[in-house]
């Protein structure tokens, strides 16, 4: 469930603190409820960037697990189509710390509406 997603995010946050990854990532910091699935897709795609850049097994495994969890939760809600949402590339670029904080925020939005 989404609580496990948050714990994976916290784990990623802890893991990257010991590394020096200075990537900037497309970050949706003001998610409109009608675009939350689109925003989630952008967050997950950017997480894969973190995984690539880190070259770390623990981060890699945690990112994959997080994507598997999110996929399964969202698939159980059926196909959700959203329109008029920003493309990932249109989002503001932020550092990893801000990116992860915004990610936790959107997951909490899913928890509050489930």
């Amino acid at each position: 469930n989404w609580v496990n997603v948050i714990s994976d995010l916290k784990k990623i946050e802890d893991l990257i603190q010991s590394m020096h990854i200075d990537a900037t990532l497309y970050t949706e910091s003001d998610v409109h409820p009608s675009c939350k699935v689109t925003a989630m897709k952008c967050f997950l795609l950017e997480l894969q960037v973190i995984s690539h850049e880190s070259g770390d097994t623990d981060i890699h495994d945690t990112v994959e697990n997080l994507i598997i969890l999110a996929n399964n939760i969202l698939s159980s809600n059926g196909n959700i189509t959203e329109s008029g949402c920003k493309e990932c590339e249109e989002l503001e670029e932020k550092n990893i710390k801000e990116f992860l904080q915004s990610f936790v925020h959107i997951v909490q939005m899913f928890i509050n509406t489930s």
């Epitope: 897709k41 097994t57 623990d58 890699h60 495994d61 990112v63 994507i67 969202l74 698939s75």
Partner: antibody, heavy 122, light 112 residues
Framework: EVQLVESGGGLVQPGGSLRLSCAAS????????MSWVRQAPGKGLEWVAT????????YYPDSVKGRFTISRDNSKNTLYLQMNSLRAEDTAVYYC???????????????WGQGTLVTVSS | DVVMTQSPLSLPVTLGQPASISCRSS???????????LEWYQQRPGQSPRLLIY???NRFSGVPDRFSGSGSGTDFTLKISRVEAEDVGVYYC?????????FGQGTKLEIK
């Protein structure tokens, strides 16, 4: 050439336990997630378990959840499947397979072992 | 769970002729990141399964170019442009977009 060699199969009574092993060679074992897939005699393939590269994350279908445990020892390049509370319907050839990462190539079991037969019967 | 349904279950083909196998999923297997994790595996008689196609249409290394994959959403197809004797066996589609990962029932290809 990538090699995966399963062992540990055999005849076991219903309710019994068995541990399968899969010895990996000719690739960096710790860089790959791994899976077990089984095939009952004359039947199709069924996914049984997957484990992440580091071993922290495991995935199972409901048919084996709580009875089977996938694990790995990266220092020994070996994958395991601990099978408890075995049932007649667990009778199958068990294959181990190397799994390409979602992040690097998009999920796929690219190399398979030759399989080991598990027979559950009284 | 995602159910994968293959057709036909048996496929008699003349050597040199094309063959086509269909695979339908009970729901879309496009994942949240937009990827479709659909593979095709071949199992020759008495052998272990072998990866042919991954992510719908990507041929695995060493797989002859007479094999091709296509499709999207819930409908997928494996095509063999000209069947050869070594193609005899059972073909399985497999989805690993969503846990539990699931195989189709298999399609047995035989020579007429």
């Amino acid at each position: 050439e990538v090699q995966l060699v399963e062992s540990g199969g055999g005849l076991v009574q219903p309710g019994g336990s068995l541990r399968l092993s899969c010895a990996a060679s000719e690739f960096t074992f710790s860089n790959y997630a791994m899976s077990w897939v089984r095939q009952a005699p004359g039947k199709g393939l069924e996914w049984v378990a997957t484990i992440s590269r580091g071993g922290d994350y495991t995935y199972y279908p409901d048919s084996v959840k709580g009875r089977f445990t996938i694990s790995r020892d990266n220092s020994k390049n070996t994958l395991y499947l601990q099978m408890n509370s075995l049932r007649a319907e667990d009778t199958a050839v068990y294959y181990c397979a190397r799994r390409v990462s979602m992040i690097t190539g998009g999920w796929a079991m690219d190399y398979w072992g030759q399989g080991t037969l598990v027979t559950v019967s009284s | 769970d995602v159910v994968m349904t293959q057709s036909p279950l048996s496929l008699p083909v003349t050597l040199g002729q094309p063959a086509s196998i269909s695979c339908r999923s009970s729901q879309s297997i496009v994942d949240i990141t937009g990827n479709t994790y659909l593979e095709w595996y071949q199992q020759r008689p008495g052998q272990s399964p072998r990866l042919l196609i991954y992510k719908v249409f990507n041929r695995f290394s060493g797989v002859p170019d007479r094999f091709s994959g296509s499709g999207s959403g819930t409908d997928f197809t494996l095509k063999i442009s000209r069947v050869e004797a070594e193609d005899v066996g059972v073909y399985y589609c497999f989805q690993d977009s969503f846990v539990p990962y699931t195989f189709g029932q298999g399609t047995k290809l035989e020579i007429k």
